[in-house]
């Protein structure tokens, strides 16, 4: 079986992980999307999800996780604010499309959070220890209980970010891509 590739992020406590899951196809625009953590030997666990149907540019907050789905731009923005060491782990974005299995949106993210004050010179103020300001309109969505075993056992081809190749709705590389933007390198 193909091994899933991972994108590694190394951040310090208090910083913000900021990723964009790029789904590109209009048919996915209003589908419910989720941010999951994958622990060794376990099924992916959904930590946060958008509403169903997903609302455009409407922030959903679950704890320190904020999801924003930009329908008109085919982007799901995921932010994990005020990172803690225990947030370290393997994450992924998926699109729920019952009764079909969820689509995984991009190569998994290996997040490594280390101790250390992030407010060093040149720091982005979004990533300091200060309380993160969330718009008052944020809501918490109910996430589906099921998680597809396929996201654990079946590895999709490596995503290559919008390369101009012939398209197939089965080949996930042509359905999605991602731009990963950590606040700090």
């Amino acid at each position: 079986a193909t091994k899933l590739t991972e994108e590694k992020y190394e951040l310090k406590e208090g910083q913000t992980l900021d990723v964009k899951c790029d789904y590109t196809l209009e048919k996915f625009a209003s589908s419910q999307k989720a941010w999951q953590i994958i622990r060794d030997g376990e099924m992916p666990k959904t930590l946060a999800c958008t509403e169903r149907p997903s609302k455009n540019s409407h922030p959903v907050q679950v704890g320190r996780i904020i999801l924003e789905d930009y329908h008109d731009h085919g982007l799901l923005r995921v932010r994990m604010v005020n990172l803690q060491v225990e947030d370290s782990g393997l994450y992924q974005c998926v699109i729920y499309q019952p009764p079909k299995e969820p689509h995984m949106l991009f190569d998994r993210i290996r997040l490594v959070v280390t101790k250390g004050f992030s407010g060093t010179p040149g720091s982005n103020e979004n990533s300091t220890q200060n309380v993160y300001k969330i718009p008052p309109t944020t809501t918490k969505a109910l996430c589906p209980l099921y998680t597809s075993p396929r996201t654990v056992t079946q590895a999709p081809p490596k995503s290559t970010a919008d390369v101009s190749t012939p398209d197939s709705e089965i080949n996930l590389t042509n359905v999605t891509d991602i731009i990963r933007v950590p606040v700090f390198n």
Partner: antibody
Framework: EVQLVESGGGLVQPGGSLKLSCAAS????????MHWVRQASGKGLEWVGR??????????YYAASVKGRFTISRDDSKNTAYLQMNSLKTEDTAVYYC????????????WGQGTLVTVSS | DIVLTQSPDSLAVSLGERATINCRAS??????????LHWYQQKPGQPPKLLIY???NLESGVPDRFSGSGSGTDFTLTISSLQAEDVAVYYC?????????FGQGTKLEIK
């Protein structure tokens, strides 16, 4: 291989009408928005408009210069996009390109070779 | 409408030298810190060819002497070492808002 082939261009008098076609192959046509871009001789590129997919109710958007005169449509069963041009003006004379993006508001990765429309009396 | 203004209108650069083309938008073309600004190359008698998408991503098959940078309203296309086959007109284009718009084009020639 993705291919876009425009047809229907030609000479038409001011005030007249013309319908351009864009035959697509090599990809799942119904999944992508289709666009028209034009270029007058020796001039720059001008986006004409786009039509979205069934998921977006085939919504259309146009440049101000053609709004109310041009209509974009599509027939997913024929893998074809259309540009209906009415009340044509001499300034509409251009090569018209059909293009396909890479998804929602993404870049134009695929272009046809273009078809020439000449509006002249 | 978002107006894209390219500078210069024309540019003459020696073979092997660096060429830089700028594109300024009348308002931001970013959504969620993601720039919907693309660069195309067009040679006479041909349709445009995609070079750079979303400000800085090199299209597959495009030589790596081409690069793009910028965000918000200011963007740059750079050719690190000009080759004879790079003589063309270059356009920036935004897809962040309808109507989509193109810059007026920059003609690149060899000095």
């Amino acid at each position: 291989e993705v291919q876009l082939v425009e047809s229907g261009g030609g000479l038409v008098q001011p005030g007249g009408s013309l319908k351009l076609s864009c035959a697509a192959s090599g990809f799942t046509f119904s999944t992508y928005a289709m666009h028209w871009v034009r270029q007058a001789s020796g001039k720059g590129l001008e986006w004409v408009g786009r039509i979205r997919t069934k998921s977006s109710n085939y919504a259309t958007y146009y440049a101000a210069s053609v709004k109310g005169r041009f209509t974009i449509s599509r027939d997913d069963s024929k893998n074809t996009a259309y540009l209906q041009m009415n009340s044509l003006k001499t300034e509409d004379t251009a090569v018209y390109y059909c293009t396909r993006d890479m998804g929602i508001r993404r870049q134009f990765a695929y272009w046809g070779q273009g078809t020439l429309v000449t509006v002249s009396s | 409408d978002i107006v894209l203004t390219q500078s210069p209108d024309s540019l003459a650069v020696s073979l092997g030298e660096r060429a830089t083309i700028n594109c300024r938008a009348s308002e931001s073309v970013d959504t969620a810190d993601y720039s919907f600004l693309h660069w195309y190359q067009q040679k006479p008698g041909q349709p445009p060819k995609l070079l750079i998408y979303r400000a800085s991503n090199l299209e597959s098959g495009v030589p790596d002497r081409f690069s793009g940078s910028g965000s918000g309203t200011d963007f740059t296309l750079t050719i690190s070492s000009l080759q004879a086959e790079d003589v063309a007109v270059y356009y920036c284009q935004q897809s962040n808002e309808d109507p989509y718009t193109f810059g007026q084009g920059t003609k690149l020639e060899i000095k």
